[in-house]
Interface confidence: medium
C-alpha cells in the first residue's frame, strides 16, 4: 500500500524508539568509521524530520525514499573522503545506485579497535549516569563491527544487555552477575551476525531463487505439519524480509518481520504445534523466539515420495508445467521427513533431482531415465555422515583447543596464502563444531554440524573475498553455495605453494602473553601453529606436536620465572632454534 | 491467508447455462488442488467437481454431473472455473469453492477434510 511519506509511516509503525535505533544501526553499519557522536547527530535529524513529516505528510521532503533521504543525510558527512576514500564517490550517484554503492563498501573486517569491556563499576556507573547514550554506543558499536547484523534482532539484543545492566548493577557481587550475561551476549551476537552473513551472501551472491530454496528446505523441517501453501507464503514473506534487512532497508525490515511474527501467530494451528510460549511474548523475544523454534513432529504416516515423484508417469508433464513449483514441492516434501538432514545436504538432493529431471524429460523414454533417481542420493546422504562420524570421533579424542589446532593445520595446509588471522579466526570457529553438534544424538548431529559449518566457511569467504589470495578458496566460495563444505573437504595440500620465507619475529614472545586470558594465549599458540605450517607445510602431526609441545612448556616455564621479559628473549631463541632444527628449517 | 471468493452464481432457467469463477489469492496458486462442492437446502455438502494442480493434469466429477460440468483452471490468474451446462432444478444449491495442497501425482480429493480453504460459496438458483 502507496503512503504519501514512507518516513512518516514507519515512524508511526515502529515507534521512536526502535526508529532511532534502527536508523542508528542503518548509519554505523554503512558508515563504520565514524564517530558515535557524529551518527547521534545524524540520527537526531532524521528523526527530528520525521515527525514534521507525521504531522504533515505533505511537508517539504517527506514524500522522499527512504534511501534518498538517508544516502543525503550520510553524504553530509564532512570527512567522507578523507575517512573513506572512493566511497565518496557513492555520493555522486543517484538512488537506486547510490545506496547500491554504500552496500558494495560495508566492510566485513574493518580496521577498528577490538572492544576492551571496562571494569564492571565504570560500566555501571557510565549505566546510571546516561542509560540511553549507553544503550546506544552498544548498538553503535554492534552494528559498525557488524555491517549485516540482523537489525530486528540487535534490537533484541539491545533489549537483553539492558536488562542485564539494570538487575546486575544492583546486586551484590556485580560482576559475578554481569560478566556471565555479557560474554553469552558477546557470543551469541557473533553467532548471530555470522548466521545473518550468510543469509546475505546467498541473496547477493546466489540470488533469490537460492534462499527461497533455503528457506523451504529449513521451514519444512520446522513446520513439517503446514502445508506446502502455508511454507510457500512463510517463504515469501521471509524473503522480503532478508532481503530487505541485507539491503540495508532497516525499517521496512524491521516492521515486515513484526507482521510476519503477528501473521504465524495468528494463524500457528495451521503452522506449528510449538509455538504456542512464542506467541505469548513481546514482539522482540516473539520474533526471536520463532526464529529458534525447535521442529514440530512429523505428522504420522507420510506416503512414500516415489509414488509422486518417481513412479508417476506425469513427473515430467508436472515438471515442465512449473518447474521451481514441482522442485519446491520435492524439496518440501523431503525437508518435512528429514529433520535429520542438513538444509544444505537436502538442497544437494533437490539439486540433483531437478538435474536429472532435466536430462531424463528430454530422453526417449523419461521414465525409465529417472526410474533410480533417489539411487543416486544415497552417496551424497553418506557422505556428511562419515564425515561427522570420523570427525566427532576426534574430538572426542582430543578435546576442542587440540581439535582446533587439527583444523588448523589441515586447512593451513589446503590453503596456505589466507592470512594468518583468517585461518586462525575460521579455524577456531570450525573447531567449535565438536562442543556444539557431537554432544547431540544422531538424528540431530548432521543438521547441526553441516549448517554450523556453512555459516563459518561463508566467513572464510566474505573475508578472502575483500583481498583475495587463493584461487582454490575463489573456486570453493563462487560454483556452489550448497557444496562449499565438500569443496574445502576435498582440498587436497596445495602442491603449488611455495613455503614462507622463515622470519624469527614472527616466534618471538614477551612477558605479556602471561596476562592473557587462556582464550588469547590459545590465539597466540595458534597463531604460531599457523606460522608454522606456512614454513613447513609438509611438517608431520608428530613433528608440529612436538614443537607446540615444546612451545606450551616454554610459555609456561616464562610465565613462572621472576625475571619473565629476559626468559621469553633467551628461551625463546633456544626454542627457535631447536623447532627449526626439529622441522629441519 | 488465503482467500477464497467464488463469483458467477445466479437464477437461470432448467437448460440453461452458468460460469462459476474462483479466485484464489495465493501467487502459489499452481500448487494447489481445486474442488467444487455444493450445499442444497437441509442437505449435507457434496463433492461436485475437482481439479489437480496442474492444468488439467487430472480431473474428477460426481456422477450426478458428469457430462454436463466442466471444471478447468487458469494458473496464470490463479482462478479456478466451473462451466455448468444443461442445469436441472436439483442442480439449485450454495456452490462453495475449496482449495487442497496435495502431492502432485494425486487425484483431486472427493473428502471435504482434504481441503484446507474454503470461499464462503456463490448461490445458483435453477428454476423450472
Known amino acids: 500500500d502507496a503512503h504519501k511519506s514512507e518516513v512518516a509511516h514507519r515512524f508511526k509503525d515502529l515507534g521512536e524508539e526502535n526508529f532511532k535505533a534502527l536508523v542508528l544501526i542503518a548509519f554505523a553499519q554503512y558508515l563504520q568509521q565514524c564517530p558515535f557522536e557524529d551518527h547521534v547527530k545524524l540520527v537526531n535529524e532524521v528523526t527530528e524530520f520525521a515527525k514534521t513529516c507525521v504531522a504533515d505528510e505533505s511537508a517539504e521532503n517527506c514524500d522522499k525514499s527512504l534511501h534518498t533521504l538517508f544516502g543525503d543525510k550520510l553524504c553530509t558527512v564532512a570527512t567522507l573522503r578523507e575517512t573513506y576514500g572512493e566511497m565518496a564517490d557513492c555520493c555522486a550517484k543517484q538512488e537506486p545506485e547510490r545506496n547500491e554503492c554504500f552496500l558494495q563498501h560495508k566492510d566485513d573486517n574493518p580496521n577498528l579497535p577490538r572492544l576492551v569491556r571496562p571494569e564492571v563499576d565504570v560500566m555501571c556507573t557510565a549505566f546510571h549516569d546516561n542509560e540511553e547514550t549507553f544503550l546506544k554506543k552498544y548498538l553503535y558499536e554492534i552494528a559498525r563491527r557488524h555491517p549485516y547484523f540482523y537489525a530486528p534482532e540487535l534490537l533484541f539484543f539491545a533489549k537483553r544487555y539492558k536488562a542485564a545492566f539494570t538487575e546486575c548493577c544492583q546486586a551484590a557481587d556485580k560482576a559475578a552477575c554481569l560478566l556471565p550475561k555479557l560474554d553469552e551476549l558477546r557470543d551469541e551476537g557473533k553467532a548471530s551476525s555470522a548466521k545473518q552473513r550468510l543469509k546475505c551472501a546467498s541473496l547477493q551472491k546466489f540470488g533469490e531463487r537460492a534462499f527461497k530454496a533455503w528457506a523451504v528446505a529449513r521451514l519444512s523441517q520446522r513446520f513439517p505439519k503446514a502445508e506446502f501453501a502455508e511454507v510457500s507464503k512463510l517463504v515469501t514473506d521471509l524473503t522480503k524480509v532478508h532481503t530487505e534487512c541485507c539491503h540495508g532497508d532497516l525499517l521496512e525490515c524491521a516492521d515486515d518481520r513484526a507482521d510476519l511474527a503477528k501473521y504465524i501467530c495468528e494463524n500457528q494451528d495451521s503452522i506449528s504445534s510449538k509455538l504456542k510460549e512464542c506467541c505469548e511474548k513481546p514482539l522482540l523475544e516473539k520474533s526471536h523466539c520463532i526464529a529458534e523454534v525447535e521442529n514440530d513432529e512429523m505428522p504420522a504416516d507420510l506416503p512414500s515420495l516415489a509414488a509422486d515423484f518417481v513412479e508417476s508417469k506425469d513427473v515430467c508433464k508436472n515438471y515442465a508445467e512449473a518447474k521451481d513449483v514441482f522442485l519446491g514441492m520435492f524439496l518440501y516434501e523431503y525437508a518435512r521427513r528429514h529433520p535429520d538432514y542438513s538444509v544444505v545436504l537436502l538442497l544437494r538432493l533437490a539439486k540433483t533431482y531437478e538435474t536429472t529431471l532435466e536430462k531424463c524429460c528430454a530422453a526417449a523414454d523419461p521414465h525409465e531415465c529417472y526410474a533410480k533417481v533417489f539411487d543416486e542420493f544415497k552417496p551424497l546422504v553418506e557422505e556428511p555422515q562419515n564425515l561427522i562420524k570420523q570427525n566427532c570421533e576426534l574430538f572426542e579424542q582430543l578435546g576442542e583447543y587440540k581439535f582446533q589446532n587439527a583444523l588448523l593445520v589441515r586447512y593451513t595446509k589446503k590453503v596456505p596464502q589466507v592470512s594468518t588471522p583468517t585461518l586462525v579466526e575460521v579455524s577456531r570457529n570450525l573447531g567449535k563444531v565438536g562442543s556444539k553438534c557431537c554432544k547431540h544424538p544422531e538424528a540431530k548431529r548432521m543438521p547441526c554440524a553441516e549448517d554450523y559449518l556453512s555459516v563459518v566457511l561463508n566467513q572464510l569467504c566474505v573475508l578472502h573475498e575483500k583481498t583475495p589470495v587463493s584461487d582454490r578458496v575463489t573456486k570453493c566460495c563462487t560454483e556452489s553455495l550448497v557444496n562449499r563444505r565438500p569443496c574445502f573437504s576435498a582440498l587436497e595440500v596445495d602442491e603449488t605453494y611455495v613455503p614462507k620465507e622463515f622470519n624469527a619475529e614472527t616466534f618471538t614472545f614477551h612477558a605479556d602473553i602471561c596476562t592473557l586470558s587462556e582464550k588469547e594465549r590459545q590465539i597466540k599458540k595458534q597463531t604460531a601453529l599457523v606460522e608454522l605450517v606456512k614454513h613447513k607445510p609438509k611438517a608431520t602431526k608428530e613433528q608440529l606436536k612436538a614443537v607446540m609441545d615444546d612451545f606450551a612448556a616454554f610459555v609456561e616455564k616464562c610465565c613462572k620465572a621472576d625475571d619473565k621479559e629476559t626468559c621469553f628473549a633467551e628461551e625463546g631463541k633456544k626454542l627457535v632454534a631447536a623447532s627449526q632444527a626439529a622441522l629441519g628449517l | 491467508q488465503l482467500q477464497v471468493v467464488e463469483s458467477g452464481g445466479g437464477l437461470v432457467q432448467a437448460g440453461g447455462s452458468l460460469r462459476l469463477s474462483c479466485a484464489a489469492s495465493?501467487?502459489?496458486?499452481?500448487?494447489?488442488?481445486m474442488g467444487w462442492f455444493r450445499q442444497a437446502p437441509e442437505k449435507e455438502r457434496e463433492f461436485v467437481a475437482g481439479i489437480s494442480w496442474f492444468a488439467g493434469a487430472t480431473t474428477d466429477y460426481a456422477d450426478s454431473v458428469e457430462g454436463r460440468f466442466t471444471i478447468s483452471r487458469d494458473n496464470a490468474k490463479n482462478t479456478a472455473y466451473l462451466q455448468m451446462n444443461n442445469l436441472k432444478p436439483e442442480d439449485t444449491a450454495v456452490y462453495y469453492c475449496?482449495?487442497?495442497?496435495?502431492?502432485?501425482?494425486?487425484?483431486?480429493?472427493?473428502?471435504?477434510?482434504?481441503?484446507?480453504?474454503w470461499g464462503h460459496g456463490t448461490q445458483v438458483t435453477v428454476s423450472s
Open positions: 495465493e501467487r502459489t496458486f499452481v500448487a494447489y488442488a
Open positions: 475449496a482449495i487442497s495442497h496435495q502431492l502432485p501425482g494425486g487425484r483431486p480429493g472427493r473428502d471435504m477434510d482434504s481441503y484446507s480453504y
